[in-house]
Amino acid sequence: KNLKSPQKVEVDIIDDNFILRWNRSDESVGNVTFSFDYQKTGMDNWIKLSGCQNITSTKCNFSSLKLNVYEEIKLRIRAEKENTSSWYEVDSFTPFRKAQIGPPEVHLEAEDKAIVIHISPGTKDSVMWALDGLSFTYSLVIWKNSSGVEERIENIYSRHKIYKLSPETTYCLKVKAALLTSWKIGVYSPVHCIKTTVENELPPPENIEVSVQNQNYVLKWDYTYANMTFQVQWLHAFLKRNPGNHLYKWKQIPDCENVKTTQCVFPQNVFQKGIYLLRVQASDGNNTSFWSEEIKFDTEIQAFLLPPVFNIRSLSDSFHIYIGAPKQSGNTPVIQDYPLIYEIIFWENTSNAERKIIEKKTDVTVPNLKPLTVYCVKARAHTMDEKLNKSSVFSDAVCEKTKPGNTSK
């Protein structure tokens, strides 16, 4: 009886793993083996595919074959017993085009209210992605184990930190890789779970802001407790994209090591032009906080994005605020050559209840005020460009009293 050729051959490539699967065309015939040949583009001869000769099952692995992954190849298969079937030719394919990105390797670290995720490609020194290793980005899905409500985070790099979590809570997540340059989306990693720690005695510093004063940067932050010492560290932001060895060499800012106030001042020339990450940690001598959230600090923008200067004209039920260009040292106005929006915060002097107005215009009305009442106003500028997404620090608060009734005209 003539043997039939195997049918429905599927080629699965995940990272550097090349797997072939096929269907037996005749289940009734026992002790059949299968063999593959391959042919490279531009070649006439067929070569035996090592790892896929005389196979008794309907699956084989030809990962050991050192192929040029960008070169088209053709495969053929036949069945063998005493005689052989005719060859069945598989459509030619380019391994790189066909390849899927495998699940990445994931390691987790826990803090009390944060999780650090370290991600690396599932196949070390992959041949398939050798030219693209630096281009991987990742996305993840995270959920509280108890609730299952998922949150997606896109476009992250090989180390990512998720903040604002709850202490002593188990979070689960899965991660997949993408090569946006090749329109490839990978498969998810297995689910990894980790429990955040008990709440730390010392919270991390919050609300870190950088401003420019004369030739110095002024770094300010908020802290819950008094009598603390703080240290500030910096890192080149581009290193976060580097899938290298997961060791980020954060550096001390010398003037911000063991400072006893919630601010520190250091010369602008500490940083060359570039984008940096900054973080702050608190210590009381016995205990140390976890690091604050990292803030992005762009020397180019920071140097120019100063808090706005404004004048207030007081009426009985409103303030008219006129925003002008900020002044540098020497009282010269700064030319801001990119569009800004202004955030104006005002409050009654005797109250903590703040109200906020966001405006693109440089003349702003603050309505619904009470007559003969002292209100305080502060403002800051934001860049409108999403990529830059920078904010100045708030200006100093200016307090004014509204006029007596009926002066709104």
Partner: antibody, heavy 118, light 107 residues
Framework: QVQLVQSGAEVKKPGASVKVSCKAS????????IHWVRQAPGQGLEWMGR????????KYAPKFQGRVTMTADTSISTAYMELSRLRSDDTVVYYC???????????WGQGTLVTVSS | DIQMTQSPSSLSTSVGDRVTVTCKTS??????VAWYQQKPGKAPKPLIY???YRYSGVPSRFSGSGSGTDFTLTISSVQPEDFATYYC?????????FGPGTKLDIK
């Protein structure tokens, strides 16, 4: 493969200095920190400090501050630990180790015994 | 400085037994704890990093758990080559510190 090979045993007099070397191979020393840990006979491990070979930034344990100097020569992939004003209780084994972020101290040298004796 | 205590300080056990060593830190160190095994005259051998991850080549009978201030090293079935001293190590903040060690010997 990754290796840290330390210099040989030394005998020193009290008050003298000793300089122990740690030669790295199988990785770029600039990409990691090199830590130094010591161990007295029959005792536990004691962290002395670390150096970033890329820019020579150091952190020392307060106990050794002022007496220890860590340096590195990246051209020959070697880190050094010098301890001055030696006392008899500095008779210990000194280890160098590679620090790899959350992987901690993932490779160690074989250790160097320094004996301080008059 | 972050203090580290380990218990027990020594432990006599038999091949095949399950052994647990605990380590306490004087403050929350997240999951920045590693474990090392040391045999006489040898350098420490890394076993566990980041609380629960085994280094490559470390047998699966070794496992780590915990977070915050309480950490555990477990050997599920002690083998003859496991008789050694075990150290925990915090690398959360400088100066880094080690536990005093737990000596595992044959009963």
């Amino acid at each position: 493969q990754v290796q840290l090979v330390q210099s040989g045993a030394e005998v020193k007099k009290p008050g003298a200095s000793v300089k122990v070397s740690c030669k790295a191979s199988g990785f770029n020393i600039k990409d990691y920190y090199i830590h130094w840990v010591r161990q007295a006979p029959g005792q536990g491990l004691e962290w002395m400090g670390r150096i970033d070979p890329e820019d020579a930034e150091t952190k020392y344990a307060p106990k050794f501050q002022g007496r220890v100097t860590m340096t590195a020569d990246t051209s020959i992939s070697t880190a050094y630990m010098e301890l001055s004003r030696l006392r008899s209780d500095d008779t210990v084994v000194y280890y160098c180790a590679r620090y790899h972020g959350y992987w901690a101290l993932d490779y160690w040298g074989q250790g160097t015994l320094v004996t301080v004796s008059s | 400085d972050i203090q580290m205590t380990q218990s027990p300080s020594s432990l006599s056990t038999s091949v095949g037994d399950r052994v647990t060593v605990t380590c306490k830190t004087s403050q929350n160190v997240g999951t920045n704890v590693a474990w090392y095994q040391q045999k006489p005259g040898k350098a420490p051998k890394p076993l566990i990093y980041s609380t629960s991850y085994r280094y490559s080549g470390v047998p699966s009978r070794f496992s780590g758990s915990g977070s915050g201030t309480d950490f555990t090293l477990t050997i599920s079935s002690v083998q003859p080559e496991d008789f050694a001293t075990y150290y925990c190590h915090q690398y959360f903040s400088y100066p880094y510190t080690f536990g005093p060690g737990t000596k595992l010997d044959i009963k």
